[in-house]
Amino acid sequence: SITGISPITESLASLSTYNDQSITFALEDESYEIYVEDLKKDKKKDKVLLSYYESQHPSSESGDGVDGKMLMVTLSPTKDFWLQANNKEHSVELHKCEKPLPDQAFFVLHNRSFNCVSFECKTDPGVFIGVKDNHLALIKVDYSENLGSENILFKLSE
């Protein structure tokens, strides 16, 4: 469960892939589309508001009792819209919603290296936001394999 209704911190950052492609958001027919693309040098990168929440890891899974805390993030590129996991479609979508946000809007933050992060679905452990065919998608990662798969690695630039 998320231990507080308020984020412990927030930051405004642009999101790019491991290969330095930008994640951009465009309003089309009254809904937002998410793109993964090479930006022209003079084009400004879209910013995302990341809100960080503390979450207790279920002790039955971890054996940690009260000591297993995770950082969950929500990602909002524009007011009232949040990235959400659609586990049925294996897709990542932007939805307008009110608080409290649904579980599908929360992602467990992983620092894969000092500069790279991954976002794991709160609602589907082992499934991460990733890049597939120049779009964001949900990608299942086998923990026995190398978790450094480049298609689930992202960089945050404030």
Epitope: T9, G63, D64, M70, L71, L147
Partner: antibody, heavy 121, light 106 residues
């Protein structure tokens, strides 16, 4: 209860080597970033090394780069610090520390009690 | 590398005093900053994380503020058990500690 217990400290001559160990218990060791921090006698704290949960990446300040190596054995819930080419200025209490959260590099939430390394001829 | 400069390096205060310690980063670190308390012969203890959040079990007389390059740790009413050394610590770019502030009894 989270526990971190360092061992392996002692007296070593300049130019010598030492390997410190940290035995971890009470948490899922393989899910956390781990760190070594040192404190010279009467001085402040200095970060010495960091390692990712899967040991894929490690990091060092310039003061120890090329001489110290951090490693971990997730099957044994153990963290290590291999220290080579030791100098008098490496004399310090060495602490093992755990990240505050699963998977992330932020904050040193738990610390061991430290092990003293003395480099002297 | 980011340098963290703490001031003062030491201060004398009495029980009940309001104490303020400052930390300045050599470049902006947003709020990726902690405060630690260390007593002689003991390991450091996390007090404040992400600039302002109180670690579980830490008394509410401790508070943190600041963002960017300038940060403050405040003890609203100093208690006997608060005489210790305090360190700031950044994790925005690499990891580095401030030089420490020793809080002594006046």
């Amino acid at each position: 209860e989270v526990q971190l217990v360092e061992s392996g400290g002692g007296l070593v001559q300049p130019g010598g080597s030492l390997r410190l160990s940290c035995a971890a218990s009470g948490f899922t060791f393989s899910s956390y970033w781990m760190y070594w921090v040192r404190q010279a006698p009467g001085k402040g704290l200095e970060w010495v090394a960091a390692i990712t949960p899967n040991a894929g990446e490690d990091y060092y300040p310039e003061s120890v780069k090329g001489r110290f190596t951090i490693s971990r054995d997730n099957a044994k819930n153990s963290l290590y610090l291999q220290m080579n080419s030791l100098r008098a200025e490496d004399t310090a209490v060495y602490y093992c520390a755990r990240g505050q959260y699963y998977y992330t590099k932020y904050s040193l939430g738990y610390w061991g009690q430290g092990t003293l390394v003395t480099v002297s001829s | 590398d980011i340098q963290m400069t703490q001031s003062p390096s030491s201060l004398s205060a009495s029980v009940g005093d309001r104490v303020t310690i400052t930390c300045r980063a050599s470049q902006p670190i947003h709020n990726h900053l902690d405060w630690y308390q260390q007593k002689p012969g003991k390991a450091p203890k996390l007090l404040i994380y992400f600039g302002k959040n109180l670690q579980e079990g830490v008394p509410s007389r401790f508070s943190g503020s600041g963002s960017g390059t300038d940060f403050t740790l405040t003890i609203s009413s100093l208690q006997p058990e608060d005489f210790a050394t305090y360190y700031c610590f950044q994790y925005k770019k690499g990891w580095s500690f401030g030089g420490g502030t020793k809080v002594e009894i006046k």
